[in-house]
């Protein structure tokens, strides 16, 4: 096709691809009608003057994953139609001034994964049509003022994975069309007030994996179109009360891996579009009332791996659309019976790895759509009667690694587990911790010959202990699941405790080590 070099493949669609370690210079002659040229995985170390002079129709040029360390200023002369230029994954340390001169049509410039030490305003001063500039994965330590001043049409700028320690508040001031700004994996310790003020069309701001300790109160106040804000893995210890106040379009906010100790009510919002909030790996110790009340559309709230020991009953007010709540690996000992009452659409709740000693009987009373509950590795000895009875969609319940007390009071839980087993995951079985003669034995195969109470007391109406989807109605209106009177009233009040008689001889039980936990 108009003379395709032997080291390359050329297609009818005017696409040329030259690959292989044997290539040490730009192959010639290149087809004059080439519109796309890819030079990949070669041993080319430098680009001399005008190697692409005769292919002026070129629109896309990818010179990636080579040994390229030096480029002559006139290397891209005569490529006035070029719209896409990638020099990514090479060994460039320096860009010659004027390298991109004459590339009047250039829209995408990829310089990522090189060894660039600095950029200067003159580098991009001719690239007035540039929309995308990728500089991530270099060795940049600072960005001089004016570096991007001529890139008024830029919509995407990636400066991630460099060595930036500070950002001038003026460096982005002319980028009014910028939609994506990525500064992740640098060494930024703070962002000056006003740094993002000119970015009125910004939709994504990635600041994760820096060393930011403090956020200025008005840092994001001009970014009304921001949709995704990544602040994870920094050193943020507190959030100024108004820092997120002007972000009505935000739908994703990550704050995990910081040093947050507390969250004040109203800190988030109003953010009517926020769908996910990631707060794990912080030092949060308590959640006050209404702390998330502005997040009406939140679907995922991740609060795991903190130090939460107290959750106010109204902490989750307003989260009517929440689907997933992760509270695992905290320091919870008790939960208020109403704490999840507002979470009518909750599907998955993770409470494992806490210190929960008991659960209120009405803890899941209004959360009828729950599909998964993780309660493993707590201090639970038993669960209230009927706690799961109304959860017709539950298909994963994890209860192992708790010190279950296998006396007669465990029978309702044991029966519930047995009668509902086809709907539950085949996870590790709950194992008895006490009394001593049943320790290590499976809760669902303990011997259940229960002694009769010596004094007959009329039974108090209890929570119905029915399996899911019973074939006949399981609880009449008189025993409503949300009835707090029933939750607090004892089920049976015998004068002597009934106990489960169990043989402690493992060989008689035929227990394997796996079964005995």
């Amino acid at each position: 096709y108009h003379g395709c070099p032997s080291e390359c493949t050329c297609s009818r669609a005017s696409q040329v691809e030259c690959t292989g370690a044997r290539i040490v210079a730009v192959p010639t002659p290149l087809p004059w009608n080439a519109m796309s040229l890819q030079i990949l995985n070669t041993h080319i170390t430098e680009l001399n003057e005008s190697p692409f002079l005769n292919i002026s129709a070129l629109i896309a040029l990818r010179i990636e994953k080579n040994e390229l360390s030096r480029i002559t200023p006139g290397a891209f002369r005569n490529l006035g139609s070029l719209r896409y230029l990638s020099l990514a994954n090479n060994k460039l340390q320096v860009l010659p001034i004027g390298l991109f001169q004459g590339l009047d049509s250039l829209e995408s410039l990829l310089l990522s994964s090189n060894q660039l030490l600095q950029i200067q305003p003159a580098h991009f001063s001719q690239c007035s049509n540039l929309k995308e500039l990728q500089l991530h994965g270099n060795h940049l330590e600072y960005i001089p003022d004016g570096a991007f001043d001529h890139l008024v049409g830029l919509t995407k700028l990636n400066l991630g994975k460099n060595s930036l320690t500070h950002i001038s508040p003026r460096v982005f001031q002319h980028l009014g069309n910028l939609q994506v700004l990525r500064l992740y994996e640098n060494r930024l310790t703070d962002i000056p007030m006003g740094t993002f003020d000119g970015l009125v069309n910004l939709q994504e701001l990635a600041l994760q994996q820096n060393q930011i300790g403090l956020l200025s109160p008005g840092l994001f106040h001009n970014n009304h179109n921001l949709q995704r804000l990544y602040l994870s893995n920094n050193h943020i210890s507190q959030l100024p009360p108004s820092v997120f106040m002007q972000l009505p379009q935000l739908n994703r906010l990550t704050l995990f891996g910081n040093s947050l100790k507390e969250l004040s009510p109203g800190i988030f919002g109003p953010m009517p579009n926020l769908r996910e909030l990631w707060l794990y790996d912080n030092h949060i110790s308590s959640l006050p009332d209404n702390v998330f009340s502005n997040l009406r559309q939140l679907q995922v709230l991740i609060l795991s791996r903190n130090q939460i020991s107290f959750i106010s009953p109204g902490a989750f007010n307003g989260l009517t659309e929440l689907r997933e709540l992760s509270l695992h690996t905290n320091a919870l000992q008790d939960l208020d019976g109403n704490v999840f009452r507002m979470l009518a659409n909750l599907q998955n709740i993770s409470l494992q790895n806490n210190r929960l000693r008991q659960l209120p009987g009405n803890i899941f009373a209004n959360v009828n759509g729950l599909m998964a509950i993780q309660l493993q590795n707590n201090q639970l000895e038993n669960l209230p009667l009927g706690i799961f009875d109304h959860l017709g969609k539950l298909c994963e319940l994890r209860l192992y690694d708790n010190p279950w007390r296998c006396d007669s009071d465990i029978l309702p839980l044991r029966n519930w587990l047995l009668l509902n087993q086809p709907r539950l995951g085949t996870d590790t079985v709950p194992v008895c911790f006490s009394p001593a003669n049943v320790r290590g034995q499976s809760l669902i195969i303990i011997n259940v010959n229960v002694a009769v109470p010596s004094v007959h007391v009329p039974e108090v109406p209890s929570y119905p202990e029915t399996p899911w989807y019973p074939d006949t109605p399981s609880y009449p209106d008189t025993t409503s699941v949300s009835s707090t009177t029933e939750l607090t009233s004892p089920v049976e009040d015998y004068t002597d405790l009934t106990t489960i008689q169990v043989t402690d001889d493992r060989s008689v039980w035929g227990m394997t080590q796996a079964q005995s936990g």
């Epitope: 309702p412 009668l419 087993q421 259940v448 399996p467 019973p470």
Partner: antibody, heavy 113, light 111 residues
Framework: QVQLQQSGPELVKPGASVKMSCKAS????????IHWVKQMPGQGLEWISY??????KYNERFRGRATLTSDKSSSTAYMELNSLTSEDSAVYYC????????WGQGTTLTVSS | DIVLTQSPASLAVSLGQRATISCRAS??????????MNWFQQKPGQPPKLLIY???NQGSGVPARFSGSGSGTDFSLNIHPMEEDDTAMYFC?????????FGGGTRLEIK
């Protein structure tokens, strides 16, 4: 000790209904499942249904013809069978707990015109 | 429904010897790492009696000569040593899922 005392034998006509009982003693009635099992003369065992605190599960083969109820005050479980045919002639057992650890002595039902 | 197939249909064993009855399920009866297979003994004119539950756990008051083993789909009941009193029908039963089903039975007698 745990006991399940079932009602006496029944002789009924085809198309009629019967209600048999199973009175539990020696344990807390509400803490255990009660199953009902059918055994035709000289044949195997067939699970019908269970009841636990008013919730029931049925074998599809008996749904609509068997109805389980219980009276907690007297620790008694009941099974009613309707639209009886000669195929329903059998011994009907009640049994306690998920694992059927104690059984009643059985109620013999004869359906004959 | 889970179908349980017992074998043999009848078995004669000498006193003091070992009797082995097998039960194969049409699908696994395991859950939570536990096999929900139970064994019952029934003598003429009497209700069944629970011998073994969850594959290998003895019912209350059941002599130690009765033992159960197996997992997944294949299970067995062992009686050793065989005694006169062990002449009866033996049924396996799965309680993994509704409808709970029984095997067809094995008649065990003294040789």
């Amino acid at each position: 000790q745990v006991q399940l005392q079932q009602s006496g034998p029944e002789l009924v006509k085809p198309g009629a209904s019967v209600k048999m009982s199973c009175k539990a003693s020696g344990y807390t009635f509400t803490s255990f499942v009660i199953h009902w099992v059918k055994q035709m003369p000289g044949q195997g065992l067939e699970w019908i249904s269970y009841i636990y605190n008013d919730g029931t599960k049925y074998n599809e083969r008996f749904r609509g013809r068997a109805t389980l109820t219980s009276d907690k005050s007297s620790s008694t479980a009941y099974m009613e069978l309707n639209s009886l045919t000669s195929e329903d002639s059998a011994v009907y057992y009640c049994a306690r707990d998920y694992y059927f650890d104690y059984w009643g002595q059985g109620t013999t039902l004869t359906v004959s015109s | 429904d889970i179908v349980l197939t017992q074998s043999p249909a009848s078995l004669a064993v000498s006193l003091g010897q070992r009797a082995t009855i097998s039960c194969r399920a049409s699908e696994s009866v395991d859950y939570y790492g536990i096999s929900f297979m139970n064994w019952f003994q029934q003598k003429p004119g009497q209700p069944p009696k629970l011998l073994i539950y969850a594959a290998s756990n003895q019912g209350s008051g059941v002599p130690a000569r009765f033992s159960g083993s197996g997992s997944g789909t294949d299970f067995s009941l062992n009686i050793h040593p065989m005694e006169e009193d062990d002449t009866a029908m033996y049924f396996c039963q799965q309680s993994k899922e509704v409808p709970y089903t029984f095997g067809g039975g094995t008649r065990l007698e003294i040789k």
